[in-house]
């Protein structure tokens, strides 16, 4: 028997992936466990193997189809179960009725690039990845810029309250190395959370022209 508290959290990327984390105090180290997804109104079901990510938590990704295919809609409810092997049978360790579009976490933005850089400003663009056509333009973004001598945690957050896949960073210091990250969140979903941060984009502002005021 397993004692202790269990937490089972999943997010849908809005297209064809449900990522789950299962945490269990006093957990079974050498037991094989999996997540099983059973939609209420689809002909398919899906399973993934839970792999350890820390002492007492496991994670896996349910791949529902091709990355950009719309495998679930807002009407679907998916029964998600954690099943662990006990001898010759499987035991249900956790279960939830999962509303995919109430529990969204999109993929991190991709293809970050510097569109134009000057001494004091830099224009950066990006793309969203595997985001449902359902959202239309109703997405928001957060961005942050890493300045020399600071940490990401200290970087102020810039909020873009609409689907705007570019930003113009102002009041930068000439001839200085920066890094930039962005993340995305749909407005839809009670338990929706921010995507992971994008891979950092490194850029350098242009040096100030000699003999000129900057």
């Amino acid at each position: 028997a397993v004692n202790g508290t269990s937490q089972f959290t999943c997010f849908y990327n809005s297209r064809a992936n449900i990522s789950c984390v299962w945490s269990q105090d006093g957990a079974l180290q050498d037991t094989s466990c999996q997540v099983h997804a059973w939609p209420d109104r689809r002909r398919w079901n899906q399973t993934c193997e839970l792999l350890p990510v820390s002492q007492a938590s496991w994670a896996c990704n349910l791949i529902l189809g091709a990355p950009d295919s719309q495998k679930l809609t807002t009407v679907d409810i998916v029964t998600l179960r954690v099943l662990c092997r006990e001898g010759v049978r499987w035991r249900v360790m956790a279960i939830q009725d999962f509303k995919p579009f109430e529990n969204l976490r999109l993929m991190a933005p991709i293809s970050l690039q510097v569109v134009h850089v000057e001494t004091h400003r830099c224009n950066i663009s990006w793309e969203i990845s595997q985001a449902s056509h359902y959202f239309e333009r109703h997405l928001e973004f957060e961005a942050r810029t890493l300045s020399p001598g600071h940490t990401w945690e200290e970087a102020p957050l810039l909020t873009l309250k609409q689907k705007q896949e570019w930003i113009c960073l102002e009041t930068l210091t000439p001839d200085t190395q920066y890094e930039f990250q962005v993340r995305v969140k749909p407005l839809q979903g009670e338990f929706t959370t921010w995507s992971p941060w994008s891979q950092p984009l490194a850029f350098r502002t242009k040096p100030a022209a000699l003999g000129k005021d900057t």
């Epitope: 719309q70 809609t73 807002t74 009407v75 579009f101 109430e102 056509h133 359902y134 959202f135 239309e136 109703h138 407005l187 839809q188 009670e190």
Partner: antibody
Framework: EVQLVQSGAEVKKPGATVKISCKVS????????IHWVQQAPGKGLEWMGW????????EYAPGFQDRVTITADTSTDTAYMELSSLRSEDTAVYYC??????????WGQGTTVTVSS | EIVMTQSPATLSVSPGERATLSCRAS??????LHWYQQKPGQAPRLLII???QSISGIPARFSGSRSGTEFTLTISSLQSEDFAVYFC?????????FGQGTKLEIK
């Protein structure tokens, strides 16, 4: 500019079938959802269903499920709503609208359907 | 299905004054509530999504708020073009349902 232009008014006899068209422009029809909404005289709005042109799926409200069929022709950027076994209480204005699944962002001008013997 | 109840059925307000329209859900719908405006002979127009998010192009005098299952649409200073019927709509439980509407008329 987003536009949804619906076909003209219809007069039908009880038991007949009506088919309304909704020609769209100004957005990618193949990646859109088109909803249909009924507004009967003196009554509120009633959501009937949608077609998801990208996924190729339809959803219908239970109250209309047995009698409504929503289709789309992506070659002409036109959606259709067919309502069968018409009765007098189906006399209403019918709207097509574009949106995500959750709300309706842009609406057609409406098509009046009168059911009378 | 979820029943959406709007109150009052008719609201009489003078131009320049504030109007407060209410929409109550028969069960918890999180923030999945959207507001529309409909003028006579016209199609509805989307105003507010998710209880409080304004749609671009909608004047700033329109705002939304939520307290539990009760949602409020506030028009801070009524203009002549604001007199219309207002509908709320929930998208929490399928099928989506609308309120019966509040008619906002000139006092």
């Amino acid at each position: 500019e987003v536009q949804l232009v619906q076909s003209g008014a219809e007069v039908k006899k009880p038991g007949a079938t009506v088919k309304i068209s909704c020609k769209v422009s100004g957005f990618n029809f193949k990646e859109s959802l088109i909803h249909w909404v009924q507004q009967a005289p003196g009554k509120g709005l009633e959501w009937m269903g949608w077609i998801d042109n990208e996924a190729g799926e339809t959803e219908y409200a239970p109250g209309f499920q047995d009698r409504v069929t929503i289709t789309a022709d992506t070659s002409t950027d036109t959606a259709y709503m067919e309502l069968s076994s018409l009765r007098s209480e189906d006399t209403a204005v019918y709207y097509c609208a574009r949106g995500g699944p959750w709300f309706l962002s842009y609406w057609g001008q409406g098509t009046t359907v009168t059911v009378s013997s | 299905e979820i029943v959406m109840t709007q109150s009052p059925a008719t609201l009489s307000v003078s131009p320049g004054e504030r109007a407060t329209l209410s929409c109550r859900a028969s069960q918890i719908i999180s923030n999945n509530l959207h507001w529309y405006q409909q003028k006579p002979g016209q199609a509805p127009r989307l105003l507010i999504i998710y209880g409080l998010q304004s749609i671009s192009g909608i004047p700033a005098r329109f705002s939304g708020s939520r307290s539990g299952t009760e949602f409020t649409l506030t028009i801070s200073s009524l203009q002549s073009e604001d007199f219309a019927v207002y509908f709320c709509q929930q998208s929490n439980n399928f099928p989506w349902t609308f309120g019966q509407g509040t008619k906002l008329e000139i006092k």
